[in-house]
Amino acid sequence: GSSPRSGVLLRGCPTHCHCEPDGRMLLRVDCSDLGLSELPSNLSVFTSYLDLSMNNISQLLPNPLPSLR
């Protein structure tokens, strides 16, 4: 379900990634240099920026981030 409207709830931040708010709603997600072989699974729909550099992701399936706008 959708998360309630609140100023005190943190948006979903994938394990081991670093996250930083981007304005009132959005989230910048830095998952660089984590040795990932696939995309992080619990990305917030409010992700405005995603850094996956310096990982081991060799291929992406079609529409790999369906939850993102």
């Epitope: 609140s6 100023g7 005190v8 709830l9 979903g12 994938p14 708010p21 009132r24």
Partner: antibody, heavy 117, light 107 residues
Framework: QVQLQQPGAELVKPGASVKLSCKAS????????MQWVKQRPGQGLEWIGE????????NYNQKFKGKATLTVDTSSSTAYMQLSSLTSEDSAVYYC??????????WGQGTTLTVSS | DIQMTQTTSSLSASLGDRVTISCRAS??????LNWYQQKPDGTVKLLIS???RLHSGVPSRFSGSGSGTDYSLTISNLEQEDIATYFC?????????FGGGTKLEVR
């Protein structure tokens, strides 16, 4: 710089109501939520509720519904919390604090509320 | 409500020590954890959000880690100005809840 100004202390009688104020400056008041937190002497922190000054939307901790009412006056960039039917259990320090995307980045100095006859 | 537990209510350490303060949630909070510092005069400051993101102006000797239900705040080189009470807070679901606090004292 960001400032949240709260009165240092309030003394009220049991059964009465009190309206605590929190005057914000140094930022755009309607761009941030305002949180209210209670701390009893020697105790931890307890979230009371929050208000979005842009449209006065509120969320309350179920425990404080009927006890606390949050409002804002955007013309003076001031947030208020009214506490009703006061008892000694309401004696505490009350903090206002602003938040954005899930974390509370600036806190007021707190108002010490004493309920005593 | 999610319960946040800081098992150590007070901690004594020497200046220069590496200090770790732990916090446990009653359920998985998916890294949605903040740490706050409360000075003896009551002043409260944000240290860390999103489990590990240092707030602007916070010294780099502070760091946060953990996952799932278990999280920790580490001060790598304790200074006099760090003497305070430290609270964790979950931002996973309403109502947000705080740990009981860990009071840090100088040995």
């Amino acid at each position: 710089q960001v400032q949240l100004q709260q009165p240092g202390a309030e003394l009220v009688k049991p059964g009465a109501s009190v309206k605590l104020s929190c005057k914000a400056s140094g930022y755009t008041f309607t761009n941030y939520w305002m949180q209210w937190v209670k701390q009893r002497p020697g105790q931890g922190l307890e979230w009371i509720g929050e208000i979005d000054p842009s449209d006065s939307y509120t969320n309350y901790n179920q425990k404080f519904k009927g006890k606390a009412t949050l409002t804002v006056d955007t013309s003076s960039s001031t947030a208020y919390m009214q506490l009703s039917s006061l008892t000694s259990e309401d004696s505490a320090v009350y903090y206002c604090a602003r938040s954005l995307s899930g974390y509370v980045d600036y806190w007021g100095q707190g108002t010490t509320l004493t309920v005593s006859s | 409500d999610i319960q946040m537990t800081q098992t150590t209510s007070s901690l004594s350490a020497s200046l220069g020590d590496r200090v770790t303060i732990s916090c446990r949630a009653s359920q998985d909070i998916s890294n949605r954890l903040n740490w706050y510092q409360q000075k003896p005069d009551g002043t409260v400051k944000l240290l860390i959000s999103y489990r590990s993101r240092l707030h602007s102006g916070v010294p780099s000797r502070f760091s946060g880690s953990g996952s799932g239900t278990d999280y920790s705040l580490t001060i790598s080189n304790l200074e006099q100005e760090d003497i305070a009470t430290y609270f964790c807070q979950q931002g996973n679901s309403l109502p947000p809840t705080f740990g009981g606090g860990t009071k840090l004292e100088v040995r």
